[in-house]
Interface confidence: low
């Protein structure tokens, strides 16, 4: 009696179970009563990442430099190419089909985590005692100058965007 279901890594066709092609290979012809499934390796620019009955391999992803993309990992017959973004850019999505510039942290904020090819800059507000007066994708919040260690006194308090202003101690006592 013809099977109604097949084992793992097999598929049902013409009332019989044929072996699937292994990853990295595509189907050329189904098995028959007398012959095995015929499979062929994918070409250099193609891949298939599962046991399959595909008659065409998938093209490797193209990391398009005009969209700021570059190859992070070259594809094989069993894996797709992995793209990442060029210096100064990061992916807009997990599949990394396009890139956008890293954002800068505005004055009053410092860099908590520098951007990578796949993630944007993470900024954090400068806490009391720290400041940032620049828009930067690299600089952390900096501590206020310690006037005391320079034998000076605070003439103007610092903010999250400005350093303290130090001045000479009042000599008149």
């Amino acid at each position: 009696e013809p099977p109604t279901a097949c084992r793992e890594k097999q598929y049902l066709i013409n009332s019989q179970c044929c072996s699937l092609c292994q990853p990295g290979q595509k189907l050329v012809s189904d098995c028959t009563e007398f012959t095995e499934t015929e499979c062929l390796p994918c070409s250099e620019s193609e891949f298939l990442d599962t046991w399959n009955r595909e008659t065409r391999c998938h093209q490797h992803k193209y990391c398009d430099p005009n969209l700021g993309l570059q190859v992070q990992q070259k594809g094989t017959s069993e894996t797709d190419t992995i793209c990442t973004c060029e210096e100064g850019l990061h992916c807009t999505s997990e599949s990394c089909e396009s890139c956008v510039p890293h954002r800068s942290c505005l004055p009053g904020f410092g860099v908590k985590q520098i951007a990578t090819g796949v993630s944007d800059t993470i900024c954090e507000p400068c806490p009391v005692g720290f400041f940032s007066n620049v828009s930067s994708a690299f600089e952390k919040c900096r501590p206020w100058t310690s006037c005391e260690t320079k034998d000076l006194v605070v003439q103007q308090a610092g903010t999250n965007k400005t350093d303290v202003v130090c001045g000479p101690q009042d000599r008149q006592r």
Epitope: Y62, D64, N66, T92, S93, E97, S98, V100
Partner: antibody, heavy 118, light 107 residues
């Protein structure tokens, strides 16, 4: 100035292949990204895909099995083929240029109406 | 895919009025949004790119702004030639997606 001009049959029978060509002047199809977009009766616009300066293509997932975008650099044209069409593919088809993110889609063709009917 | 929710879908206004159309993106699109205009004749014209940059040759009464994932097109003083359909387009992530459109009619 950059100009794009769509051309092709205005009437296609169901199950047949819709074929359109976009002729580009004032720029080369060997630079930038050349896109197809369609507008259905009513207001809905749908992005279909592109062919890039290098010849690589991107197709919107819902059309992947039916769409082919190609180019002819000698004629400075790029083309759209959409197979197995139905009445739901009746739309105005636009070609458009995209070069830089800062500029977005900066030039559009005037559009051509394709009706799918027997 | 990124969904673009545009409102209103239709509105009527008078010459000289200030008009605002908004689009909200379902995900972060990093400012990569265009506003386009389609006249009754069918031709499409880019008005704004990168959320707030006025395209060359477009009158200064058109402006675009962004607040997070919400984008706004403003026409400061409507002119007779501005009555048309308007769409937002996100081009941050493939497939690019459009808002549902706003039909701007004469009151």
């Amino acid at each position: 100035e950059v100009q794009l001009q769509e051309s092709g049959p205005g009437l296609v029978k169901p199950s047949q292949t819709l074929s359109l060509t976009c002729t580009v002047s004032g720029d080369s199809v060997s630079s930038g990204y050349w896109n197809w977009i369609r507008k259905f009766p009513g207001k809905k616009l749908e992005y279909m895909g592109f062919i890039s300066y290098s010849g690589s293509t991107y197709y919107t997932p819902s059309l992947k099995s039916r769409i082919t975008i190609s180019r002819d650099t000698s004629k400075n044209q790029f083309s759209l083929k959409l197979s197995s069409v139905t009445a739901a593919d009746t739309a105005v088809y636009f070609c458009a240029r995209f070069r830089r993110y800062d500029d977005g889609v900066d030039y559009w063709g005037q559009g051509t109406l394709v009706t799918v009917s027997s | 895919d990124i969904q673009m929710t545009q409102s209103p879908s239709a509105m009527s206004a008078s010459v000289g009025d200030r008009v605002t159309i908004t689009c909200r993106a379902s995900h972060e699109i990093s400012g990569y949004l265009s506003w386009i205009q389609q006249k009754p004749g069918g031709t499409i014209k880019r008005l704004i790119n990168a959320a707030s940059t006025l395209a060359s040759g477009v009158p200064s009464r058109f402006s675009g702004s962004r607040s997070g994932t919400e984008f706004t097109l403003t026409i400061s003083s409507l002119q007779p030639e501005d009555f048309a359909d308007y769409y937002c387009l996100q081009y941050s992530s493939y497939p690019w997606t459009f808002g549902g459109g706003t039909k701007l009619e004469i009151k």
